[in-house]
């Protein structure tokens, strides 16, 4: 995604099909309040940002309103007059989910089914990740649904548990953003724990798709 | 596995709408994927027309934008294109396709090939 | 739009020779460019995908190469079904076509 024009970077989230937000950064620029200047249609006239992103006091990013959008957004990141980067992106390429919300835990002997609520759209996996304090590393199940059962869990052990929501490569293309990962939490026994004893710290999500 | 099928008129009088349907099977279009339609002039080279998501999302090639609607109907498991105000040049071999992998064809309709000529 | 250059426009060769076709993008397209293979009176095939990747049942003799502005479609052996058009894709802004290369029996 990012342009090298001039030294600018630039990186484009597409939020839950809601929100685009294009951000920058142009070392050669960093003291400079750059405008950015977008269309979603090639005939159109260019409309300034009126939602702009800040570092540092100066403009670091746009947000823009673009619900269920299927466009190519058509932008230009400026310094006055002057083009510093021009470019255009097909929106959908660059797709975060939301986090999973509403997210239930139904147990049965030695098994879990977790549930959330599915998001509007599509085309998407819904990742558990899981481990007890003897695991090494956390072991994942994804389904197309928000509905994944986990078997062969040892009731005595605790576990914790989080989810996310990942676009399937095969309809949106390899570009996407896993969403955030939803709040860890702990069961033991059927019954939700405060933490797991000895549970190292979970790891940052992983950004592989 | 996935097939589609092209069906409509094979010939269109000039200003006229052309109509045409792309029937899905072996995947429901209500389970995901973009939906995409192309065509080919005789002889030509292949053009893009547009693509259309089972919510009804629609994308449309700028130059036809004007001219274009593609719907779908999920209970028939198909979707659909019409193309306004044809003239001769709108004569070619119409493709449906599945988008894949971003917006790669695979696999495609056998074509349908739609002259318009008074 | 961004304009795909097909080259040659025809390519003369025998079975068991190597095919080079170019495909030369008017402005970046990173590495979103895909490879069909079209025979007469059948629909376009799916080969190569984000400029290297072969599509599934493809055979290993097809491969593409590439990013940025100019890409690669070689075939290392040609096979006698391999004669063909071969048209490169980008999805880069919008969807558009090179014009075409047409492999044939020298």
């Known amino acids: 995604q990012g342009g090298a024009a001039e030294g600018v970077q630039i990186q484009i989230i597409y939020f839950n099909l809601e929100t685009v937000q294009v951000t920058w950064n142009a070392s050669k620029y960093s003291r400079t309040n750059l405008t950015f200047h977008y269309r979603f249609n090639g005939d159109e006239a260019y409309d300034q940002c009126t939602n702009y992103l800040l570092q540092e006091g100066h403009t670091s990013g746009c947000l823009l309103d673009a619900e269920q959008r299927d466009d190519i957004l058509y932008f230009s990141i400026r310094n006055g007059t002057h083009p510093v980067f021009t470019a255009s992106r097909w929106m959908v390429y660059y797709l975060k989910p939301s986090s999973p919300k509403h997210v239930r835990f139904s147990w049965h002997q030695d098994a879990v089914t977790v549930t959330c609520s599915d998001l509007s759209y599509g085309d998407l996996l819904y990742e558990v990740q899981y481990r007890s304090p003897f695991d090494t590393e956390w072991q994942s199940k994804q389904e197309n649904t928000c509905n994944v059962t986990i078997e062969g869990l040892d009731a005595e052990k605790c576990y914790s548990f989080w989810v996310r929501v990942k676009a399937m490569e095969d309809v949106y293309g390899p570009d996407t953003y896993p969403s955030d990962w939803s709040e860890v939490t702990c069961w033991q026994r059927g019954e939700i724990r405060d933490a797991c004893a000895e549970t190292p710290t979970p790891p940052k999500p992983k950004l592989s798709k | 596995q996935v097939q589609l099928q092209e069906s409509g008129p094979g010939l269109v009088k000039p200003s006229e709408t052309l109509s045409l349907t792309c029937a899905v099977s072996?995947?429901?279009?209500?389970?995901?994927?973009?939906w995409g339609w192309i065509r080919q002039p005789p002889g030509k080279g292949l053009e893009w027309i547009g693509r259309?998501?089972?919510?009804?999302?629609?994308s449309y090639n700028p130059s036809l934008k004007r001219r274009v609607t593609i719907s779908v109907d999920t209970s028939k498991n198909q979707f659909s294109l019409k193309l306004s105000s044809v003239t001769a040049t709108d004569t070619a071999v119409y493709y449906c396709?599945?988008?894949?992998?971003?917006?790669?064809?695979?696999?495609w309709g056998q074509g349908t090939l739609v002259t318009v000529s008074s | 739009e961004i304009v795909l250059t097909q080259s040659p426009a025809t390519l003369s060769l025998s079975p068991g020779e190597r095919a080079t076709l170019s495909c030369r993008a008017s402005q970046s397209v990173s590495s979103y460019l895909a490879w069909y293979q079209q025979k007469p009176g059948q629909a376009p095939r799916l080969l190569i995908y984000d400029a290297s990747n072969r599509a599934t049942g493809i055979p290993a003799r097809f491969s593409g190469s590439g990013s940025g502005t100019d890409f690669t479609l070689t075939i290392s052996s040609l096979e006698p079904e391999d004669f063909a058009v071969y048209y490169c894709?980008?999805?880069?802004?919008?969807?558009?076509f090179g014009g075409g290369t047409k492999v044939d029996i020298k």
């Open positions: 072996g995947y429901s279009i209500s389970s995901g994927y973009y």
């Open positions: 396709a599945r988008n894949w992998g971003g917006n790669w064809f695979d696999p």
């Open positions: 894709q980008q999805r880069s802004t919008w969807l558009t």
């Open positions: 259309i998501y089972h919510s009804g999302t629609t």
